[in-house]
């Protein structure tokens, strides 16, 4: 795991208004783990960053981002309606300068160094789920979630109208 | 236009049972999680009960004061959430108001008109 | 349960001055960062109507003079400059726990 001292110092101050043009509403240093307790963790090899999703020792730190909170409108053709109303959007870095990515192409996440305003594919749409949880929508692919697959975070495409267990598209933050 | 209409209110005798139906039209019904909110003749809001998505198994949650005795359902295929309450009482007498969440599930946005629940002998 | 609580329970005031709507709760409806903590206006007849969301963010078609503020546990409405159709009860609800509680409402009139 890397960038946990350096993340502790991750001031708001690191995160100016230039994204997108807007600033956060508010902004949130935390832990992110899956709906059954693993760790998602951010390893530099080969001079990129991977993301596991894997149970930590017990004493073992660990890794924080810090998720940046923003209102957006919801477009109309997503939603099915014209007057959603606003709802939460999050970036969720890890370390300065590094965003995760949504790689539609690939249905993968990544994490890459990126100048601001950030793109797109490192939005997305933040849902309320029970059992203290979110999910993370890709702004870019409506339908779209993170979630996770053979111990990786993966893009998972989810039908609301199916039957499915979706626990894998279940994250929990904590700021322990 | 977004909607949502409730039906199937009136007068019902104490230990008696009534079926709320709640039509919507205007969205795409399946990908929101729906509620029941009721509020009592010259008093405040209460929530009720929420039912969520297929794909959250249709997951369902209750005020205390109406668990057991009511239950909350949707038929997608209908754009239509029910709300049955059985074993009524007369502090259940009140408007009974359909309502949607946000996309992302933050608040409640659209709300039907009320229809009037009266347990009375 | 958590107990919201507001005050005042009624408030009158002049045309074009500021009032202002207090929401406790009996504890923090803090989580992820954020509180879950929404402003509902209902007008006599109406079905309510969202304003304020997490705390601060204010619903969409809603007028600037509508503002949130608060953490935690306490929570305050503003209207800045009361216009005649702002006659309303305004409510407080946390979202954060199951049952989602509102509070018992502030009834808002012009002096």
């Known amino acids: 795991a890397f960038g946990i001292s350096g993340v502790q110092k991750y001031t708001r101050a690191l995160h100016d208004s230039s994204i997108t043009g807007i600033s956060p509403i508010t902004e949130y240093l935390a832990s992110l783990s899956t709906y059954n307790d693993q760790s998602i963790t951010f390893a530099l090899e080969d001079e990129s960053y991977e993301i596991y999703v894997e149970d930590l020792k017990k004493d073992e730190k660990k890794d924080k981002v810090l998720l940046s909170y923003y209102e957006s409108q919801h477009p109309s053709n997503e939603s099915g309606d014209g007057v959603d109303g606003k709802m939460l959007m999050v970036t969720l870095s890890p370390t300065k300068d590094f965003w995760l990515h949504a790689n539609n192409k690939e249905h993968s996440v990544e994490l890459h160094k990126c100048e601001k305003p950030l793109p797109d594919q490192a939005f997305f749409v933040l849902h309320n789920m029970h059992s203290n949880c979110v999910s993370f929508e890709c702004k870019t692919d409506p339908g779209v979630f993170i979630g996770v697959k053979d111990n990786h975070l993966a893009l998972i495409k989810v039908d609301s109208s199916e039957n499915l267990c979706t626990e894998n598209i279940l994250f929990k933050l904590s700021e322990t | 236009e977004v909607q949502l209409v409730e039906s199937g209110g009136g007068l019902v005798q104490p230990g008696g049972s009534l079926r709320l139906s709640c039509a919507a039209s205007?969205?795409?019904?399946?990908?929101?999680?729906m509620n029941w909110v009721r509020q009592a003749p010259g008093k405040g809001l209460e929530w009720m009960a929420e039912i969520t998505l297929k794909f959250n198994n249709y997951a369902t949650h209750y005020a205390e004061s109406v668990k057991g005795r009511f239950t909350i359902s949707r038929d997608d295929s209908k754009n239509t959430v029910y709300l049955q309450m059985n074993s009524l009482r007369a502090e259940d007498t009140a408007v009974y108001y359909c309502a949607r969440r946000n996309y992302g599930n933050w608040y409640i946005n659209v709300w039907g008109q009320g229809t009037l629940v009266t347990v009375s002998s | 349960d958590i107990v919201m609580t507001q005050s005042p329970d009624s408030l009158a005031v002049s045309l074009g001055e500021r009032a202002t709507i207090n929401c406790r709760a009996s504890e923090s409806v803090d989580k992820f960062g954020m509180s879950f903590l929404n402003w509902y206006q209902q007008k006599p007849g109406q079905p309510p109507k969202l304003l304020i969301f997490?705390?601060?963010s204010q619903g969409s078609g809603v007028p600037d003079r509508f503002s949130g503020s608060g953490s935690g546990t306490d929570f305050t409405l503003t209207i800045s400059s009361l216009q005649a159709e702002d006659v309303a009860v305004y409510y407080c609800?946390?979202?954060?726990?199951?049952?989602?509680?509102f509070g018992q409402g502030t009834k808002v009139e012009i002096k």
């Open positions: 997490v705390a601060s």
């Open positions: 205007g969205f795409t019904f399946s990908n929101y999680w």
């Open positions: 609800q946390q979202s954060k726990d199951i049952p989602y509680t």
